[in-house]
Amino acid sequence: SEVEYRAEVGQNAYLPCFYTPAAPGNLVPVCWGKGACPVFECGNVVLRTDERDVNYWTSRYWLNGDFRKGDVSLTIENVTLADSGIYCCRIQIPGIMNDEKFNLKLVIKPAKVTPAPTRQRDFTAAFPRMLTTRGHGPAETQTLGSLPDINLTQISTLANELRDSRLANDLRDSGATIRIG
């Protein structure tokens, strides 16, 4: 089942997706599409990378993170209710049926009358505590034990740090992937 992410109308939505590139070597092509991941490729492609660059994108969709290190998280600018739905992040690992597929559900809420602080409103909001580590092989995924309790202050700090890509970079440098949604 999809992990759910939330954003408000008019704000930016953030859909996290990470992988650990082989080192040294080329990046793995990635595609983002609107709709659940099909058997191959992405349906309704909104953004695509190749071994080096973002080589296709549509307006409002971009990669805010250090994508050449594997942070291929999608930012959708100025979201509307029509942006709600399932998005597919597909890591196109060479070889037959090696792709890693992630379906992420985006829920857009009407804008609140009273605005929240900007940095936290820009960041999608729900926080299930799930941390996985990924080795260099495409199939090597293990789930760690439960994380320590995180209070609300730590959550907002974590969101800010991740949005700034610093924590995300540190985690990937140690071979970890974090999903916050």
Epitope: P21, A23, P24, G25, N26, L27, E51, R52, D53, V54, N55, W57, S59, W62, L63, N64, G65, D66, F67, R68, K69, G70, T75, E77, D173
Partner: antibody
């Protein structure tokens, strides 16, 4: 010392082709991308394309697609840029510039064009 | 491709003064992969800043870069005589890679 040394100036007639070379030294040639950038007299910089010196993959700016070919000779640590069907507006200084093969696990994921060749003046005139 | 607009076109300042150069992108720059280069007449460009804010090797700390998304700034805290040159911004995350039109920093 890390450096890129380019071939000498060229004068070509419209419709001809030109091939500019860029010899790398002081670093592992195959661990970097090589880009080509041109600059018309008194104008700004224009990216033409890249080659991954490790695997030979290339990418070209759509503006030059079909006219430009970037190749490399790993044994000579040299990259080449050939531009065909030359016209007067191709008169420019042509630069090669290197850029890391990524990913890198510490620091930023990219270092941009950190070393440039000295430039090769290509004049297209009848 | 992404269009980079630099302003001002020319900046007339005296040595010791602070220079602030702007680079605005038509769309968000992926990964904040934005670089700044300095070019002097008859020379190749020289990398100053990469990743929007990281100084390249050997670049004096009077040069600093900031910004993200669509708005980026290069600041030279105190201009030295050798800093008078043309400065270009470049995005290198989305193909085609593009350069701004340049800002000339000249002696007042």
């Amino acid at each position: 010392e890390v450096q890129l040394v380019q071939s000498g100036a060229e004068v070509k007639k419209p419709g001809a082709s030109v091939k500019v070379s860029c010899k790398a030294s002081g670093y592992t040639f195959t661990s970097y991308y090589m880009h080509w950038v041109r600059q018309a007299p008194g104008q700004g910089l224009e990216w033409m394309g890249w080659i991954n010196a490790g695997n030979g993959n290339t990418k070209y700016s759509q503006k030059f697609q079909g006219r430009v070919t970037i190749t490399r000779d790993t044994s000579a640590s040299t990259a080449y840029m050939e531009l065909s069907s030359l016209r007067s507006e191709d008169t420019a200084v042509y630069y090669c510039a290197r850029d890391h093969v990524l990913p890198l696990y510490y620091g930023s994921g990219s270092y941009a064009f950190d070393i440039w060749g000295q430039g090769t003046m290509v004049t297209v005139s009848s | 491709g992404i269009v980079l607009t630099q302003s001002p076109g020319t900046l007339s300042l005296s040595p010791g003064e602070r220079a602030t150069l702007s680079c605005r992108a038509s769309q968000s720059v992926s990964g904040d992969y934005l670089a700044w280069y300095q070019q002097k007449p008859g020379q190749a460009p020289r990398l100053l800043i990469c990743g929007a804010s990281s100084r390249a090797t050997g670049i004096p700390d009077r040069f600093s870069g900031s910004g993200s998304g669509t708005d980026f700034t290069l600041t030279i805290s105190r201009l030295e005589p050798e800093d008078f040159a043309v400065y270009y911004c470049q995005q290198y995350g989305s193909s085609p890679y593009t350069f701004g039109g340049g800002t000339k920093v000249e002696i007042k």
